[in-house]
């Protein structure tokens, strides 16, 4: 059997928002499902589709989904149909409409005291609720003369009046929203007694010193008053000028002149008729004096040929709104052709070099006129004047790659050394025309540089090798004093190098010949056994052809090397008591001993009373504390070696003796006593 | 206007079973889908399962599903849950609610049943 | 099953105030672009209120001053100006699929 799982159900849905029927079947075989809209088949549109077998509605509509839905799940094989519950959309609307007349049956027979309905023509689901407005005032039940229906949609007016003009507008609302009139109906009923107004005052700006006219007529019978108020309700009259309005003139038409007009002048002016019957009929206009900003600046532009460019002219703040126009050498630019303004903008299509140079944005209105220039540069592709060369530098000395450019606007130059770029250090210079220096050239400089020189137009670029000319040097320089251990094997190395390979030889600095126990080996001096006359000055010599000879001399010392004669030992202290470290050296030169206590060197000058360093090199430390516990170092050095060696030092508590332990007991560890 | 009736308690003993009642009035009994909601205290509510008044259609909650029975008498217009093997673990409140069978919301509920499992 | 997280679990609002309860679901309940998100609200003693149906349509009879919103997986009811009447539990529960299941609910107090 087919079963319903979910079934469409008739629900409350808006006009225009989304909507769902639901439909779910479960049955043994395969199911057809579709849909009937009053019996007849649902085709699927954009707004209307089946999703799975449910209905989807993306926007209902009133009129195309008014009826019965019905879900209908059919088995093509058995022929067995099922068909869900019915269900039907409440849909919500509201739709604006007129404001027409509905009696009498046109405009031209609406006369004082006759009566007057209105209709409103907004209609919608469910019932809307009517307000009636007029001169956007809303109306209420029987108010001045009126019937209105605020359920209906009529209003009516018994008996008619000329009170009773103006604009009359409606609004409706019900659950969907709410809707006003698309159209209102001005309501105009005469009385000649009324003020009517035949010459309204326009707003007017004025530069100053200049005059303004204010033109106002009424008409009615009889005759009605004019009268000209200014902004603090000031009456205006021939007689009787406020101290700021001196020079204004009423004239007997009703317009009103005012000369030399002043910034005190501005503000709001009415005119106010009034007739016999009636309320008074108030016209306003403004008088604004003319003004005009200054321009903001242009930034000097940059155009490469060829391309189209646009520049915007900001016209300045003013009143009233400035005319703007573009002006080249004095000429005013046209509105058409390569070269020509559109709107506040001048453009430039297609552009050449010949269209550099500066041009003028003009403003101006009543209050005067700005200008402002900008200066457009066409920029053109580099050319060159050098071009990098293939260059030979010598060590150690400045050395020069050129890269001489022309172009507009002035190009920037950058270079390139083993196609990473060159940022200016302490060791490479830029020059403003291009040139590269590098400063105490290295041997490692020699490699590829490009130099890359551009504008916004393009860029051009080359590349050059350098090749270094090594200097004679000595690689490294040998350390000009050295030491040798006596009765052992030594070795002074010398090395050099140029732009040839060096020959490396070493002689004695008297001249004297190396003895035969002394051989010198591809520049290293070898001593088999070192005595005590082989110390002594040794001149290492590097020559080769192009660049002659350079010479270092050592010193060659021999000495004993250091040994400890006596180290410290691990040391434990009472308190109070006396430490001493113990510590001898012995070399040749005969070593100096220094201690470091707690990671700092003792200085025997700033040791204090309670620490002395002996003549043999022992360390004392009376009355100790137990901040002095730690490693103490001791270092034994001469002008050819240096040696160290540490030991601990604790301090603890004396121990209270127990009654039990005789006067001869021993501590509970190895310690000294003082 | 729509009313569900539901008993105010049932008292019955572990092991043995219960059938819960909800008369509805005020619509078409047939056309709403009947709901049945489980509530203890400091548990929460918990959605038993559904039945189709008209063609007598069921779903469950899988977790009730071997425990309850839906039936409906359509001349009374009454639906029917059935508890088997009760214990103390099936004491709650139980509510019949009627069932939008489109968005199926729950817009009207019975006052509920106080059942109570205990020896 | 999809698991509905509701919060705060309690809530003190001021009479006159806005309250908000959020609930969130452990996987889209959206379908054929709807949202179903029910909420409903109890009192002790009585049996849960319908107020809102999928997801922003508001329950019959039920005040202006509540209001829902949300899609996918997040949820809101908004209950705006609260009143002296709105102390209750506040209910989520969603109608996508079997079996409908329902938020642990949040207790709504004057402040």
């Known amino acids: 059997a087919i079963v319903f799982i979910k079934q469409p159900s008739s629900q409350d849905a808006l006009q225009g928002r989304r909507a769902l029927l639901r439909c779910e079947v479960e049955a043994p075989g395969l199911v057809h499902v579709y849909w009937l809209l009053d019996g007849a088949p649902v085709q699927d549109t954009e707004r209307r589709f089946t999703q799975g077998s449910s209905l989807s509605f993306a926007a209902v509509d009133r009129l195309q989904d008014s009826g019965t839905f019905q879900c209908v799940a059919r088995d093509d094989v058995t022929g067995e149909e099922a068909r869900s519950a019915n269900a039907s959309f409440n849909i919500k609307w509201i739709e604006a409409g007129p404001v027409v007349l509905k009696h009498p049956a046109s405009e031209a027979e609406i006369q004082p005291q006759t009566q007057v309905t209105l209709r409103c023509h907004i209609d919608g689901h469910p019932r809307p609720t009517y307000q009636w407005f007029r001169d956007g005032t809303p109306l209420s039940d029987g108010q001045s003369n009126n019937t209105v229906s605020s359920k209906e949609r009529n209003l009516t007016l018994r008996p008619a009046g000329p009170e009773h003009s103006g604009l009359y507008s409606c609004c409706a609302h019900n659950a969907f929203g709410q809707a006003c009139s698309s159209q209102n109906f001005t309501l105009s009923i005469a009385d000649e007694s009324f003020a009517r107004v035949v010459l309204a005052p326009q707003d007017v700006i004025v530069a100053r010193n200049e005059e303004a006219m204010f033109h106002c007529q009424f008409s009615a019978q009889p005759p009605p008053n004019l009268q000209w108020l200014f902004e603090d309700e000031t009456p205006i009259t021939n007689r009787s000028r406020p101290p700021h309005l001196r020079r204004a003139t009423v004239f007997a038409n009703g317009s009103l002149l005012l000369t030399q007009v002043r910034p005190r002048n501005a503000g709001v002016y009415r005119c106010i008729g009034q007739g016999q019957r009636g309320p008074p009929v108030i016209l306003e206009a403004t008088l604004h004096l003319a003004e005009i900003e200054d321009m903001p600046l242009f930034e000097p532009r940059v155009f490469t040929a060829g391309s189209e460019e646009r520049v915007t002219c900001l016209p300045p703040k003013g009143l009233p709104e400035p005319s703007v126009w573009w002006e080249h050498a004095g000429v005013r630019l046209p509105t058409h052709g390569r070269v020509y303004q559109k709107g506040h903008e001048l453009v430039l299509a297609s552009i050449a070099e010949s269209d550099a140079g500066v041009y003028t944005c003009h403003a101006a209105n009543l209050a005067g006129q700005r200008r402002q220039d900008v200066n457009i540069t066409v920029a053109t592709v580099p050319t060159w004047l050098k071009k990098p060369q293939d260059s030979q530098l010598e060590e150690g000395k400045p050395g020069y790659l050129h890269c001489l450019t022309q172009a507009t606007p002035k190009p920037t130059v950058v270079w390139y050394r083993n196609q990473m770029l060159i940022s200016e250090d302490s060791r490479f210079e830029v020059f403003k025309n291009g040139t590269l220096r590098i400063n105490n050239v290295e041997v490692y400089d020699g490699t590829w540089y490009r130099c890359v020189s551009s504008t916004p137009a393009g860029s051009i670029e080359a590349q050059a090798r350098v090749q270094v000319l090594e200097k004679l040097k000595f690689t490294p320089p040998p350390q000009p004093q050295q030491c040798m251990e006596f009765d052992k094997e030594a070795t002074v190395p010398c090395s050099a190098t140029g732009r040839e390979k060096p020959t490396i030889k070493w002689e004695r600095a008297d001249g004297s010949s190396l003895p035969e126990w002394v051989t010198d080996n591809a520049g290293t001096l070898h001593f088999a056994r070192v005595t005590r006359d082989d110390a002594g000055n040794y001149t290492c010599i590097a020559s080769n052809g192009p660049q002659g000879q350079i010479r270092a001399h050592v010193q060659l010392t021999v000495a004993v090397f250091i040994t400890f004669k006596v180290e410290p030992e691990r040391t434990t202290v009472y308190q109070g008591h006396t430490a001493l470290l113990q510590c001898e050296a012995q070399g040749d030169p005969k070593p100096l001993i220094q201690w470091k206590g707690k990671d700092r060197i003792l200085d025997p000058t700033k040791l204090g009373p309670r620490m002395h360093i002996f003549q043999n090199g022992s360390l004392v430390i009376h009355d100790v504390a137990p901040e002095d516990s730690g490693r103490y170092t001791c270092i034994a050095g001469n002008s050819c070696n240096i040696k160290h060696t540490e030991a601990p030092l604790y301090v603890v508590d004396k121990p209270v003796p127990e009654e039990s332990e005789g006067p001869g007991s021993p501590p509970p560890y190895k310690m000294i006593q003082t | 206007q729509v009313q569900l009736q539901q008993p105010g308690a049932e008292l019955v003993k572990p092991g043995a079973s219960v059938k819960l009642s909800c008369r509805a009035s005020?619509?078409?009994?047939?056309?709403?889908?009947m709901h049945w909601v489980k509530q203890r205290p400091g548990r929460g509510l918990e959605w038993i399962g559904w039945i189709d008044p008209n063609s007598g259609t069921t779903k469950y909650n899988e977790k009730f599903k071997s425990k309850t029975t839906l039936t409906v008498d359509k001349p009374s217009s009454t639906a029917y849950m059935q508890l088997n093997s009760l214990t103390s673990e099936d004491s709650a409140v139980y509510y019949c609610?009627?069932?939008?069978?489109?968005?199926?919301?729950?817009?009207?509920w019975g006052q509920g049943t106080t059942l109570t499992v205990s020896s | 099953d999809i698991v509905l997280t509701q919060s705060p679990a309690s809530l003190a609002v001021s009479l006159g105030q806005r309250a908000t309860i959020s609930c969130r679901a452990s996987?889209?309940?959206?379908?054929?672009?709807?949202?179903?998100m029910n909420w409903f609200q109890q009192k002790p003693g009585q049996p849960p209120k319908l107020l809102i149906y999928?997801?922003?349509n508001q329950g019959s009879g039920v005040p202006a001053r509540f209001s829902g919103s949300g899609s996918g997986t997040d949820f809101s009811l908004n209950i705006h100006p609260m009143e002296e009447d709105d102390t209750a539990m506040y209910f989520c529960q969603q109608s996508k699929e079997v079996p409908f299941t329902f938020g642990s609910g949040t207790k709504l107090e004057i402040k």
């Open positions: 005020g619509y078409t009994f047939t056309t709403y889908w």
């Open positions: 999928a997801a922003s």
């Open positions: 996987e889209s309940v959206d379908n054929y672009g709807i949202s179903f």
């Open positions: 609610a009627r069932g939008d069978s489109n968005y199926d919301y729950f817009d009207y």
